[in-house]
């Protein structure tokens, strides 16, 4: 529980796991995405659609959930790493 976490525990460069998963309202589950040219690989939605999803953190797209998650920078928390938690 971050409420009880010691301040020193937050002094890590990045969390080892996503702090929150957020499922956007308008995720297009039905549509097939176009594959990258000849690579047979989908582009990372974090680089496009969710480029600015994580305010103070790094975006990681979870394919199984079809949703972005955020790895928060030190001092921040929340599903989009929006909050200054110190």
């Amino acid at each position: 529980d971050l409420q009880e976490a010691d301040l020193d525990l937050l002094r890590v460069t990045l969390s080892s796991k996503p702090q929150a998963l957020a499922t956007p309202n308008k995720e297009e589950h039905g549509k097939r995405k176009k594959k990258g040219k000849g690579l047979g690989k989908k582009r990372d939605p974090c680089l496009r659609k969710y480029k600015d999803f994580c305010i103070h953190g790094e975006c990681k797209y979870v394919k199984e959930l079809r949703a972005p998650s955020c790895i928060c920078h030190p001092g921040y928390h929340g599903e989009r790493c929006h909050g200054l938690s110190l």
């Epitope: 030190p74 001092g75 921040y76 929006h82 909050g83 200054l84």
Partner: antibody, heavy 114, light 108 residues
């Protein structure tokens, strides 16, 4: 030990610009956001904005968007805040603050006077 | 933006007295994002309490914090001369992060 070094004072003429510096040491500069806070004489604290040194991304208080520009120089682990079109209202102490807020610079006293 | 209103603005207390400073937010915020700072004359502010109730490193146990939603408070169990300072609350719930107007604590 985290340290944030700021010049003690700056004297600038009205209408001019000034670039305040904050040299960081004792931690990995690019891993933590840097904040800037304004304090007018005898007044409270105002959050100006913050910058992510790893990629230069910024978030500003709308009130300071046309006044302050935050930048960093990763090679020297230094954060900068440029203030433009200075008036007497900009005379204040400006602090740089580490993202966990338990380390503050000593503050730079900016005086805008002709 | 979220406005934080502190009360009282100024107060004087005798050594040993219990002090309570309140911080009222214009909209509800998570307790994870409410922090308190102490600023002594001529010095930079110092983190006192983070996330509503957690004491920062080196802060004496006579300081405590509590609250939720829009109402938060800072308590000094027994006032000491070294506690003379201005105290600020801060919210980190939404940008712009804002500070309260401050409470100046003096000694009688």
């Amino acid at each position: 030990q985290v340290q944030l070094q700021q010049p003690g004072a700056e004297l600038v003429k009205p209408g001019a610009s000034v670039k305040l510096s904050c040299k960081a040491s004792g931690y990995t500069f690019t891993s933590y956001w840097m904040h800037w806070v304004k304090q007018r004489p005898g007044q409270g604290l105002e959050w100006i904005g913050e910058i992510n040194p790893s990629n230069g991304r910024t978030n500003y208080n709308e009130k300071f968007k046309s006044k302050a520009t935050l930048t960093v120089d990763k090679s020297s682990s230094t954060a900068y805040m440029q203030l433009s079109s200075l008036t007497s209202e900009d005379s204040a102490v400006y602090y740089c603050v580490w993202s966990l807020f338990d380390y503050w610079g000593q503050g730079t006293t900016l005086t805008v006077s002709s | 933006e979220i406005v934080l209103t502190q009360s009282p603005t100024t107060m004087a207390a005798s050594p040993g007295e219990k002090i309570t400073i309140t911080c009222s937010a214009s909209s509800s915020i998570s307790s994870n994002y409410l922090h308190w700072y102490q600023q002594k004359p001529g010095f930079s502010p110092k983190l006192l309490i983070y996330r509503t109730s957690n004491l920062a490193s080196g802060v004496p146990a006579r300081f405590s914090g509590s609250g939720s939603g829009t109402s938060y408070s800072l308590t000094i169990g027994t006032m000491e001369a070294e506690d003379v300072a201005t105290y600020y609350c801060q919210q980190g719930s939404s940008i712009p992060f804002t500070f309260g107007s401050g409470t100046k604590l003096e000694i009688k």
